[in-house]
Amino acid sequence: QEDEDGDYEELVLALRSEEDGLAEAPEHGTTATFHRCAKDPWRLPGTYVVVLKEETHLSQSERTARRLQAQAARRGYLTKILHVFHGLLPGFLVKMSGDLLELALKLPHVDYIEEDSSVFAQSIPWNLERITPPRYRADEYQPPDGGSLVEVYLLDTSIQSDHREIEGRVMVTDFENVPEEDGTRFHRQASKCDSHGTHLAGVVSGRDAGVAKGASMRSLRVLNCQGKGTVSGTLIGLEFIRKSQLVQPVGPLVVLLPLAGGYSRVLNAACQRLARAGVVLVTAAGNFRDDACLYSPASAPEVITVGATNAQDQPVTLGTLGTNFGRCVDLFAPGEDIIGASSDCSTCFVSQSGTSQAAAHVAGIAAMMLSAEPELTLAELRQRLIHFSAKDVINEAWFPEDQRVLTPNLVAALPPSTHGAGWQLFCRTVWSAHSGPTRMATAVARCAPDEELLSCSSFSRSGKRRGERMEAQGGKLVCRAHNAFGGEGVYAIARCCLLPQANCSVHTAPPAEASMGTRVHCHQQGHVLTGCSSHWEVEDLGTHKPPVLRPRGQPNQCVGHREASIHASCCHAPGLECKVKEHGIPAPQEQVTVACEEGWTLTGCSALPGTSHVLGAYAVDNTCVVRSRDVSTTGSTSEGAVTAVAICCRSRHLAQASQELQ
């Protein structure tokens, strides 16, 4: 009844304030879109996030909201504005009938509207606690002290702040935005309400079992006593953090989001904005034994997304489900039977499992790294997390076959020293989404804003592809792969590196149509070759042609099939030196690899020739991998000959700068 009165009050105000003179027609040619969660049970119809165009001011947001209310009232509908967003995303949260969506989409400034949906704690079963004796043996795990310069925000359930693990380390903010618990007979028990958040706070910064014992934390309550929240509540929480950051700028900020919901454009957009404001966001990949790209905030590229492994480096199984996987996961971390603070008593401990626990580990490691090097950018931190991870230790057989190549085989680890690795040239591999099977389908892989795209390759499980090319898009290079007729689709694979003061460009040679093959080199003074790509318009390059090998003494040259256009990535950066390494075999083989020596970093990976039995090339850590069709389907003719071409670089400039600092 109280709520209805509130609605009526707002409705009257809206009617009074609406003036026809304020009416602004939506811009022509731009249509706002409607989005909702793909997982039906998680939908929350009746509540909508109306996202306005980027430049929209707060006053315009308020005016648009009032306008919606007035126009709805004229049609006899009650609406309630629950929140007006500003600081992170312009827009508002409105409670209204779905009948009004068409009207709302036509309002001025509207970019898109998203129906609210649920998000969930990612520990399973996080409330079925296995209590360990209160006198927990602290000597079992002694992580290094650290993280004292960093503040970690935890968006989770309520927490038991007087638990001895976290007492004095966690500040409980007054932020709370949670949905009602499900079920009429739900009994709120403090220890259950606090269970998930308390455990995670302990994993991040607990006295005995914490990763970053020096880190201070702030908790925001966005999950209810059943571990359930909403996208809108999470958005308002992220906005709260941004406003806090603006009011009182502190040192580095890490935001831990140990929750997941269905794919959400608006939640991903909010994460992107916060990340671009210098905040490091770490999230759970999700516990659905599924592609992490189908969930948010796990699918947001700017967020560090963490899957879970166990003590045997196996992906974590959780009942019939388990850790998510795929290209949207950045790395894995321990997430099974993790000992941490239990909300059952102030000295109790419990083990919990899930990608929430894995994400908490990485948030702790991030806090340690940022405390040692507070100036690290998000891109630098992510590259370091990848660099210091244990490589290729996860048994990939657990993942679906089509996801194995896309899922990073990395388990997070603390760096051996807190002095960082400033001398290192850091690179990572970024896979695109699958292109789809249509003839002209393409896939695009992008690097983060402050990374350089140093090379581009492609991969197709059927082998039917038309190569790849680097091209400019919005002032930045992207990697685009092309599907071929009859192909099941392609992936683009970008090699993204941290290269300060770099000036990179792409040099292209059209198909040569000569028996020598196509060649292109870096002709500008001081520019070195960091990657080679090839792209062809013909459906099949022809399998009878032998691979074209690079002439000796021409290290700055890309070579390829005569019917392909060849693209060379050429970069100038202080002290950058690169060399080409080739490994060719005369007989057919499913996999050919070549790796860079210690101290060198793989920047480019490509295959010669680009013929259809070659599925593609991609970089795994410092190894260039070329995959070909199953040996049994390829005769042992020269058709089987394949060469893996790696370009290995290092930066003398970075090495010198690092030595000067020591």
């Epitope: 490994h583 690899t593 790796a595 795994v620 410092n622 893996a644």
Partner: nanobody, 123 residues
């Protein structure tokens, strides 16, 4: 200081099995394809098999295919050679080696090699 240390060799009867291990230190183990070679008295060093850096792809010399299996544990920086259905012809010193490329059968393409472990198969 790179070190490759083989173990697990010994005397075994024909038809028997043996598992050799090779523990690596001083290198970025996951960066290297790991191979096994063997050398019988008075003969050249012979390629046995190799496991790649990525996805555990393997490549074997024809005479050991189906009998020998190479595996690796990157968490332990160790590579293994499981030898089944051993024959007297398999008697040799077995060496583990690290290469930056896969597949490669020539010992001079390997950057590092161990001291070897003796395997003797009696008839």
């Amino acid at each position: 200081q790179v070190k490759l240390e083989e173990s697990g060799g010994g005397l075994v009867q024909a038809g028997g099995s043996l598992r050799l291990s090779c523990a690596a230190s001083g290198l970025t183990f996951s960066n290297y394809a790991m191979g096994w070679f063997r050398q019988a008295p008075g003969t050249e060093r012979e390629f046995v098999g190799q496991i790649s850096q990525v996805d555990g792809f393997t490549y074997y010399e024809d005479s050991v295919k189906g009998r020998f299996t190479i595996s690796r544990d990157n968490a332990k920086n160790t590579v293994y050679l499981q030898m089944n259905s051993l024959k007297p012809d398999d008697t040799a010193v077995y060496y583990c080696a690290a290469a930056l490329a896969f597949p490669t059968t020539s010992s001079n393409t390997y950057a590092y090699s161990g001291q070897g472990t003796q395997v003797t198969v009696s008839s």
